[in-house]
Structure formats: structure tokens, C-alpha cells
Amino acid sequence: SGVFQLQLQEFINERGVLASGRPCEPGCRTFFRVCLKHFQAVVSPGPCTFGTVSTPVLGTNSFAVRDDSSGGGRNPLQLPFNFTWPGTFSLIIEAWHAPGDDLRPEALPPDALISKIAIQGSLAVGQNWLLDEQTSTLTRLRYSYRVICSDNYYGDNCSRLCKKRNDHFGHYVCQPDGNLSCLPGWTGEYCQQPICLSGCHEQNGYCSKPAECLCRPGWQGRLCNECIPHNGCRHGTCSTPWQCTCDEGWGGLFCDQDLNYCTHHSPCKNGATCSNSGQRSYTCTCRPGYTGVDCELELSECDSNPCRNGGSCKDQEDGYHCLCPPGYYGLHCEHSTLSCADSPCFNGGSCRERNQGANYACECPPNFTGSNCEKKVDRCTSNPCANGGQCLNRGPSRMCRCRPGFTGTYCELHVSDCARNPCAHGGTCHDLENGLMCTCPAGFSGRRCEVRTSIDACASSPCFNRATCYTDLSTDTFVCNCPYGFVGSRCEFPVGLPPSFPW
């Protein structure tokens, strides 16, 4: 679709005569008829296949034609066509004299023709005007013409329809050849696909407008390249969405069970060594001079009772000092100036001479210690209770009060979930890290083997000779209903043939 445009510029008819040579009275009131048609080697009369157009009276005799495209649009003259421009044409321009106001062909005398020109040739679509001048014996016509495409039509022959658009069916403008030119940020055959944010994951991300990166379910991050772990996942990661792969030291479905309490919480104080001993449990091994579950208590150097033979201990900045009782000397009052004659053994201890009476040794009764049996035995000093158990002196013995989850004399044993025999009906109990599991005997099911499931005693087809088998649900045994001619608990014997008993 396009328009053949003809711009009339100047018509010269100096003598004011018609084609017949007869003068116009009073002058030649001139209008034009234009016929555009297909190419003809010799332009002949006939249908104006590409269109016709007529002008009003434009002037008398000789005149210049005003460019009137801004006004009524009469010059240039427009000859629209709704087909592919063939590139060739024939053009006939007739100048006529209008004696009156009626310009219809049938209202004019045939000799009102002033001049007629006919041209043909090639014409490519384009913006440039071709200037031409045709001269006859008495007249001269100067004009220019061109072919341009109608709005939204493009290409060498105005055959390509293209309408710029900016909606969800395309974001483009049209190139001179009618091809689409995508607006920035859009791609695809019809420029309907946005170009996502650079780096946006091809599968896990998408966009509805340029430079955007929207994540598909299960993905996150600016470029949608990070998976979303399982909801509630505490100390875990994922490689695909909704996973929860636990970090080192963590366990459980949500990786929220602490398997490395020592590393995550550093509970042991004062340089103590921490040992993991199960989920959320640990043991601290204290450095000398410290005590307590977490080695948080500083021991006085006198707490280890270094002074012997009843010597009293005094703490000092750089250690301790023993004040020895009469008859003793040495760093720890370990040397005696006494003999058994001085009755040095307290609390019923018995004295034994040594080195020909130069020295002695006390044999202490139970619950007492020291070189003179002067100390009551404190059985907790060696911190014997494991797993944070608390040591209690109980007369002649000691006792460990264990933390929850531990048992044994020294709290050295984890409490077995199986210890209380939770599996019913003879189920076998298995300790697991986070609980227990029961393996049930035949006929029972459920987490604790508490559900009775009847055994189909007939499942093994125990009845012979086409007997019908029935399960006795109360005893989980079977009963065979024998067909005629057979007897026995399994209908295994034919009637008349006594069983051969082995006795």
C-alpha cells in the first residue's frame, strides 16, 4: 500500500489557446485530470488501473501552482494504491479549460482540452522527487512525482506491513525495510521476550520486563542461583531446593541436633579439654588447679591438702606454705622427729616403728588417711564422676549424682532407651542416636509392637487334597475342612487307609 504523488509546479500557455488552436474566452481557466496506470510501451487510452485524480481550476493561461499540501492537500496530488508497487507505471496528464463551474467530463465540450502529455517508465519507492518538464507546440508543464509507502508500509514495493508497538505482543519500531528493530531490553522474533538481568539463571530465573530476575519456586538470590533449603533447616545447606544437608557437627531432619557441642558452645573453661559424648552432652577434663563440671572453679593449692602430719596449709601468691606441728619438719611436714612412743597416730591409727625406731608409720583405720591418720578420706578429690556427674561424700563411700541421660557408678554409661523394655510382645529393641526402634515378632506391629495383627495361618496352604482352610483368629491357628473321602488334621489321609503310625 502506498501513494503516487504528483506535484504540479508550473503551466505555461502564453497564447491562451486550446489544443485545437482556438483561443479561450476570456482566458483558459485551467484544471488537470491525471490518469495513473500500469506500464504500457505505447501509452494508450483505457482504464486508469492505478487510479485517477482531478484538480479544481488552478489558474488562467500561464501560472505557477502553489504547494498546497498543508492546506487542502490538493498539491501534490495523491493517487493511493492498495497493492505491491510494481516499479513501473504509465502517467497521463491532461490540461482542460473549464468554461463554467461543472468540471465533470460529460459537462465539458470535447474541444475543451488544452494539452495532453503521456509518460511511462520505472519508478522506485523513495522520498526523492523526480522533476520533469513536457513541452508541446503551445504549452509547457513542469511537474515532479514520486512513490512513497502509506503509513505502516515498508520495503522496496510497499508490501511489508509493520506497526510499531510497545505491549506484551511486541516491543519494537520498524526499520525502512519493514523488519522489526527491538527496543532496548527486548529480544525474540517479535521482540516480545525480555532480556533478563545479566547472569540470571537460565532455568531457575525468568523475567517479565528487562533487567529483571524473578526466581522460580525453590530458588533465591539476585540471580536465582541459590536454592532455598527445607523450611526450618537450621544448620544445613542445599544443592537442590528443599534439601537440608547438615553442616559438620549437626544432625536430624532440620540439622538442629548438636552433635559437636564442644565446638559450637565451647563450654569448658580455663583451658580444659572438651570431649563430645553424644547429642548435646560433653565432658570437660580440667587442667590442674581447676574443678567443676565446666572446670569453672579455681582450686586453691591448699585444696589438695599437701601438708602432711597435721601441718596447716597457707595459700601464697606463688604457691603454698606448710606450718608443721611439733615433731615434724620439711616442705610438706613429711619428716618426723617423733617415734611411736609419742603416740603420733590419730583416729585409732596403729603405729609401726621403722629404721630401728628412728621413724614410724601409721596404719590408718578406714575413712582416715594422712601420715598420722589425721585426715578424713574425701573420695571426691579425684573427680571420678564422668559426663558432668556431681560427686557426693557418703560416709565411708562416695556416690555420683548423674546428669540426665547418664547412669552407672561413675555416670559413665549413656541411658539406653531400651533399658525400660519399651517393645511389647517380645519385640527386639534397637538403640538409635535419636531414640529407639522396635523389631516386632510375627503377628504384631506398631512403633512399640503394641498392635496385634492376625497371622493368616492359611497363607502357607497347610491343607491337602483340596480341603478348605480356615484361620482361627483367637489362636492364630488353622482348621482344615476335609472334602468327602479324606480325614486328618490336614486332610492328608484317604478314608479306609489307616495312617501308618511309627510306634
Epitope: D151, L161, K164, R165, D167, F169, E189, Q192, S208
Partner: antibody, heavy 121, light 106 residues
Framework: EVQLQESGPGLVKPSETLSLTCTVS??????????WGWIRQPPGKGLEWIGD???????YYNPSLKGRVTISVDTSKNQFSLKLSSVTAADTAVYYC?????????????WGQGTLVTVSS | SYELTQPPSVSVSPGQTASITCSGQ??????ASWYQQKPGQSPVLVIY???KRPSGIPERFSGSNSGDTATLTISGTQPMDEADYYC?????????FGYGTKVTVL
């Protein structure tokens, strides 16, 4: 051959939400060439475009219905759905789903057979 | 909002030409589609991209679009062409239908 089939309740109470699903067979809803639209036609009246959706989930709605309409897509089921909230008797219509073709410059070459939804208490 | 105006009805004798117009501001700068709808049936696309026919649509259906008016022409109208006809265009991201024209074949 592509076929579209609307499904959903034929009667909805005023102020409630109208819900319809369009199942596409004979072609993938994930084809980047197509948008998937909803159009309605009140009894004895003309066609009204409601909105459409792209397989990525991008939606476009008629401004006259915006705020009440939600269109969603389930590519795994090859379906797209319409929800219209706070309905009144004026929403009584035959509801069509259709395929809008980018190459046809937005023309809808395939339509469902339509389902009549009546809004009444 | 963008509007497309159609005459409510057009009557035509069998074999004659029926022309249905669709007017909208600068409609010629948009792509027009035309749909035929018979009673109790879904609409059928008869013209897209102003003047193109989908496969299966008879040649007697043609379209044009320029200025503010798109036109659907049915040449050699047949009784089976009696139906409602709707024009449609896109205004930004919104689909807009004309009010519809009832074509009666006398």
C-alpha cells in the same frame, strides 16, 4: 489440534470468588509464541477482554477489573486459571478461555466452548 | 479508556457485499482482528493483522485498516455468514473489543 476446555462452578453467590480453570490439550502452554487469555460475554451483550498470562507467569489485566481479577498458570498441568473476587450479578456471563498468538499480532485463533457462570444467591 | 465503535447492525442481500466498520482513535496504527460469532457458539477469528485470513476462512472475507477506521468486507455474502461480528485491537497491554455488529442476510 489444540483444544481449550473451561471448567468450574456454574453458580456463584454474590460477594464470593468466581474460580475457573482452562485446560489446554494438543499443545504446550510453555510455548513462547502464545499468551493465554480470558474473555467474557454477558447474556445478549458483547465480548469483554478480562486479562491474559504468559507461561512465565507475567499477567496483564483489564483496568476496569483490576484489583478483583487474578490469573495464574500451572505449566506442569498445562492449565491456567481465573479468579474474580467480590462478584455481583453484573459478572454473570459466558466465560471463554482463548489462545492469543504473537505471530497473529495478538489475534485469538483458538477458543474454549465457554462456560456460563451465574451470580445469584 | 480506548473504545472501538461498530454499527449495531448491517443488512445485506445474498450475493451482495457487506461492509462493517470499526472506528477508534488512530486505529490504523494498531493491528485489527475480526471475529465471527454465531448464536450459541464461540467466536471464530476471520481476519488478523488488518487484512490476513487464517486458513479455512473463505476468500470472500477481506479487511483493511487505515486512519481511524478498520473495515471488514464480505463480498458475495451467503446466508451462512449471518452472525455477530466483533473487531478487536490492543491498546498498550489491554485487549479491546468493539460492541459488535449483527449482520443479517435478507
Amino acid at each position: 489440534e489444540v483444544q481449550l476446555q473451561e471448567s468450574g462452578p456454574g453458580l456463584v453467590k454474590p460477594s464470593e470468588t468466581l474460580s475457573l480453570t482452562c485446560t489446554v490439550s494438543g499443545g504446550s502452554i510453555r510455548n513462547s509464541r502464545y499468551h493465554w487469555g480470558w474473555i467474557r460475554q454477558p447474556p445478549g451483550k458483547g465480548l469483554e477482554w478480562i486479562g491474559d498470562i504468559y507461561y512465565t507467569g507475567s499477567t496483564y489485566y483489564n483496568p476496569s477489573l483490576k484489583g478483583r481479577v487474578t490469573i495464574s498458570v500451572d505449566t506442569s498441568k498445562n492449565q491456567f486459571s481465573l479468579k474474580l473476587s467480590s462478584v455481583t450479578a453484573a459478572d454473570t456471563a459466558v466465560y471463554y478461555c482463548a489462545r492469543e498468538d504473537v505471530i497473529l499480532r495478538g489475534g485469538s485463533d483458538y477458543w474454549g466452548q465457554g462456560t456460563l457462570v451465574t451470580v445469584s444467591s | 479508556s480506548y473504545e472501538l465503535t461498530q454499527p449495531p447492525s448491517v443488512s445485506v442481500s445474498p450475493g451482495q457485499t457487506a461492509s462493517i466498520t470499526c472506528s477508534g482513535q488512530r486505529l490504523g496504527d494498531k493491528y485489527a482482528s475480526w471475529y465471527q460469532q454465531k448464536p450459541g457458539q464461540s467466536p471464530v477469528l476471520v481476519i488478523y493483522e488488518d487484512s490476513k485470513r487464517p486458513s479455512g476462512i473463505p476468500e470472500r472475507f477481506s479487511g483493511s485498516n487505515s486512519g481511524d477506521t478498520a473495515t471488514l468486507t464480505i463480498s458475495g455474502t451467503q446466508p451462512m455468514d449471518e452472525a455477530d461480528y466483533y473487531c478487536q485491537a490492543w491498546d498498550r497491554d489491554t485487549g479491546v473489543f468493539g460492541y459488535g455488529t449483527k449482520v443479517t442476510v435478507l
